[in-house]
């Protein structure tokens, strides 16, 4: 039963991680920025992995698509595929787990194959955590590296003079919302290979068999299994490390057919 | 990369009227304040008129209800229509521009064009 929760419970974590991540992805507010040298209106600029958004405090707003991918910053680019990876990985992940759950029953699956499924997408889930966390942190590292606060520096340029807008790059709602959704699918999938773990199915229940020696009142037990018919206390035949043999006395011994060779 | 290009300076009698236009070209990805800055022989460069991406104005108080700041977004320009002009009114007019850059959408740069000279005199 403990299981089957633990298993449920990383589905169900995992799920909303990379509904999260999903949402993150999506989102247009990785980093927003205040401009400040603009005397007429409060302009607040907010920008995603897909597009770049105006508004002012007018209530104008207009978003524009990176419509180019060659002429991209290389870490945006890094960013977005890690992201995409994570997503992928976690839909993977979220498919071949609902197959993998115990609570579903398909065909005649048995629980080794059913075993391999929840680490398959626990890993699965844990390499998608991975990569939304480290896309997020890449990012946040971009804009604290390069964008905290940009100074306003002049130098001329083709057709007069340049400078850089004096703005203040701050993290944006989907840096949080990655990851917190990239450590949900984290922990959903190591649930999911603890769950494994209780799935995997037991040794094979060996039946111990004591042999009579003529002669002599030991009983012999091959592999330090305590002999039993399976009606006694030790029903699950328990490996015993008592680096020895016990006389009949100590073991009670019942006859079979094999007592003898 | 990027140019501004202002036009329509020239010489004009007092009361008169000229109409200054600005275009952005190059690698732009997106514009978002335009404005006109003005700098006299011998005097400080000062904001005559800025209008946001939004159509938001602002005009300095020697030119409010003569001036008049208009964008079109499509072109990436910015016109002033100069009406009852004065002799103080003279000038280097200069375009300026905040926008970024389609390499780099996450960093925000001013531009400034070369300048349009207006002079007001009879």
């Known amino acids: 039963m403990a299981v089957t929760a633990c298993q449920g419970l990383g589905f169900v974590v995992s799920l909303i991680g990379i509904a999260g991540i999903i949402a993150a992805t999506c989102m247009d507010q990785w980093s927003t920025q205040d401009l400040y040298n603009n005397p007429v209106t409060a302009v607040f600029n907010y920008q995603g992995l897909w597009r770049s958004c105006v508004r002012e405090s007018s209530g104008f707003t207009e978003c524009r698509g990176y419509f180019t991918l060659l002429g991209l910053p290389a870490m945006l680019q890094a960013v977005r595929a890690l992201m995409i990876v994570g997503i992928v990985l976690g839909a993977i992940g979220l498919l071949v787990s609902i197959f993998a759950l115990k609570c579903i029953r398909i065909g005649s699956m048995e629980d080794s194959a059913k075993a391999n499924m929840t680490l398959t997408s626990g890993i699965m889930f844990i390499v998608s955590g991975l990569c939304a966390i480290a896309g997020v942190s890449v990012f946040a590292n971009m804009l604290v590296t390069n964008f905290w606060m940009s100074t306003a520096n002049m130098y001329t340029g083709m057709g007069g003079m340049v400078q850089t807008v004096q703005t203040r790059y701050t993290f944006g709602a989907a840096l949080f919302v990655g990851w917190v959704a990239g450590g949900l699918t984290l922990i959903g999938g190591v649930m999911m290979c603890i769950a494994c773990r209780g799935l995997a199915p037991e040794e094979t229940n060996y039946k111990a068999v004591s042999y009579h020696a003529s002669g002599h009142s030991v009983a012999y037990k091959p592999g330090g299994f305590k002999a039993s018919t399976g009606f006694g206390s030790n029903t699950k035949n328990k490996k015993i490390y008592d680096g020895g043999a016990r006389t009949e006395d100590e073991v009670q011994s019942y006859p079979s057919k094999h007592d003898y060779v | 990369q990027v140019q501004l290009v202002e036009s329509g300076g020239g010489l004009v009698q007092p009361g008169g009227s000229l109409r200054l236009s600005c275009a952005a070209s190059?690698?732009?990805?997106?514009?978002?304040?335009m404005g006109w800055y003005r700098q006299a022989p011998g005097k400080q460069r000062e904001l005559v008129a800025v209008?946001?991406?939004?159509?938001?104005?602002n005009y300095t108080d020697s030119v409010k209800g003569r001036f008049t700041i208009s964008r079109d977004n499509a072109k990436n320009t910015v016109y002033l229509q100069m009406n009852s002009l004065r002799a103080e009114d003279t000038a280097v007019y200069y375009c300026?521009?905040?926008?970024?850059?389609?390499?780099?959408?996450?960093?925000?740069?001013?531009?400034w064009g070369q300048g349009t000279l207006v002079t007001v005199s009879s």
């Open positions: 209008i946001t991406r939004g159509g938001s104005a």
């Open positions: 190059g690698s732009i990805f997106l514009i978002n304040a």
């Open positions: 300026n521009a905040d926008l970024n850059l389609r390499s780099d959408p996450f960093k925000w740069y001013t531009f």
